[in-house]
Interface confidence: low
């Protein structure tokens, strides 16, 4: 704010992120044959006019007239934060000061507290922390493209006194789709200028195998040859499979991997056909109708849990 | 721009306790500083307390130490000040204040945004 005494030097607060370079700049109007001179928060000159003052070689000068007088810190520290002050040494000394605002950034978020193999409808627990950001950041959680709800951002100072960790929790039961996913941990602060800092922990759920019975060729007829697979999907993935007819003992022979295979279609073939999919995990089994009188076979909705 | 709502306050007894309110809209509350101010009928603005934009930082007039509280709440976006053993001399309107800085500042010079004022009134 330009004051009515045109010899009141003006200047602006700055907000400069840790390692970054901030300006000076110091204005007045008249300047009644004097020169301006920038001094630290802890009152150290460091320019007087064009004169460098004090021996910091992070301090430059950028411009250095009659009216006004800036200078540069490069590789701002935290420990440069606080009022800087600019002087003009006319009758009577004025003075205006700069608030220097420095930004810590935050580290790179650390995710704790995963289980390997949780199973599915159990409550799985994370854990995120971020050091080193001032003001103190927030930290965000989420799903794939899906937002988590955490608990409220902790906020705990660092031991230097000018910096803080920050922590967060998130508790989600798992479920069979959420095999793979990635949990992502994203740490929020102004330092950062909406670029991402984040950090993933993929996890891994065990979950009972499912199946289903699949015909090749799609629409055998009597006499062609037929293979009856058994897809099954799990995790882990089942490794045992059995095939059953229905109103035959004892359990029918596959072979080829988990296929039932026909080399030549009869009429005798026609009925329905189970197949069981087993992992450590639990079993489940599909059923498929076979009628061979028919064009084609007709697949059942009917499936049942063991 | 920041908006400050004040809230809480009345009239109460001497030795009473009342708890004032401050809600921020606006520029994001938690990285700034938050001021409580007052101004007794005849007399000029003073500072009560303040606050930084941690919670961590506070200061206090010297006829607020021991009896007020000043604390915040980020997540809320709310200012509190908590005064208890009042007395007479605490009859005052009371002003929160926000600065354009991220310290603290004790001078409501340094003050940019100011709510609009609650009555405290301390009497029997």
């Known amino acids: 704010n330009l004051s009515q005494d045109d010899s009141q030097p003006w200047t602006s607060d700055e907000t400069v992120v840790a390692g970054g370079t901030v300006v000076l700049k110091c204005q007045v109007k008249d300047h009644e044959d004097s020169s301006l001179q920038w001094s630290n928060p802890a009152q150290q000159t460091l320019y007087f006019g064009e004169k460098r003052a004090l021996r910091d070689n992070r301090i430059q000068l950028v411009s250095s007239t009659p009216h006004e007088l800036s200078i540069s810190i490069s590789n701002v520290a935290l420990a440069d934060e606080g009022e800087y002050t600019c002087s003009i040494f006319t009758m009577p000394v004025r003075t205006a000061k700069s608030l220097v605002t420095v930004l810590g950034i935050p580290q790179k978020p650390i995710i704790t507290g995963y289980k390997s193999s949780l199973r599915e409808k159990e409550t799985a627990t994370l854990n995120c922390q971020s050091s080193g950001s001032k003001p103190a950041a927030q930290l965000t959680w989420r799903k794939g493209d899906q937002e988590l709800h955490g608990d409220q951002t902790r906020i705990q100072e660092d031991p230097n006194g000018k910096t803080f960790t920050v922590s967060s929790s998130v508790s989600f039961q798992v479920t069979r789709e959420d095999d793979g996913a990635n949990i992502v941990c994203s740490v929020n602060h102004e330092s950062l200028k909406g670029a991402d800092r984040s950090t993933s922990q993929r996890i891994e759920v065990l979950y009972t195998p499912t199946a289903m019975i699949r015909p090749e060729p799609a629409h055998p007829r009597e006499g062609q040859k037929l293979l009856l697979h058994c897809e099954g999907r799990g995790n882990p993935v089942p490794q045992q499979y059995v095939w059953v007819k229905e109103g035959s003992e004892p359990p029918l022979k596959m072979t080829q991997e988990s296929a039932l295979i026909f080399p030549f279609l009869n009429k005798s073939d026609s009925g329905t056909y189970g197949c069981t999919a087993t992992s450590n995990m639990g079993s489940y089994t599909a059923y498929f109708t076979l009628n061979v009188n028919d064009p084609s076979p007709v697949p059942s909705s009917s499936s049942t849990y063991h | 721009q920041v908006q400050l709502v004040q809230s809480g306050g009345g009239l109460v007894q001497p030795g009473g306790s009342l708890r004032l309110s401050c809600a921020a809209s606006?520029?994001?509350?938690?990285?700034?500083?938050r001021g409580w101010f007052r101004q007794a009928p005849g007399k000029g603005r003073e500072f009560v307390a303040a606050?930084?934009?941690?919670?961590?930082?506070?200061n206090y007039a010297d006829s607020a130490k021991g009896r007020f509280t000043i604390s915040r709440d980020n997540s809320k976006n709310t200012l509190y000040l908590q005064m208890n053993s009042l007395r007479a001399e605490d009859t005052a309107v009371y002003y929160c204040?926000?600065?354009?800085?991220?310290?603290?500042?004790?001078?409501?010079?340094?003050?940019?945004?100011w709510g609009q004022g609650t009555l405290v009134t301390v009497s029997s």
């Open positions: 606006g520029r994001t509350f938690s990285n700034y500083a």
């Open positions: 204040a926000a600065p354009a800085s991220r310290r603290p500042s004790w001078d409501a010079d340094g003050y940019d945004y």
């Open positions: 606050i930084d934009y941690s919670g961590g930082s506070t």
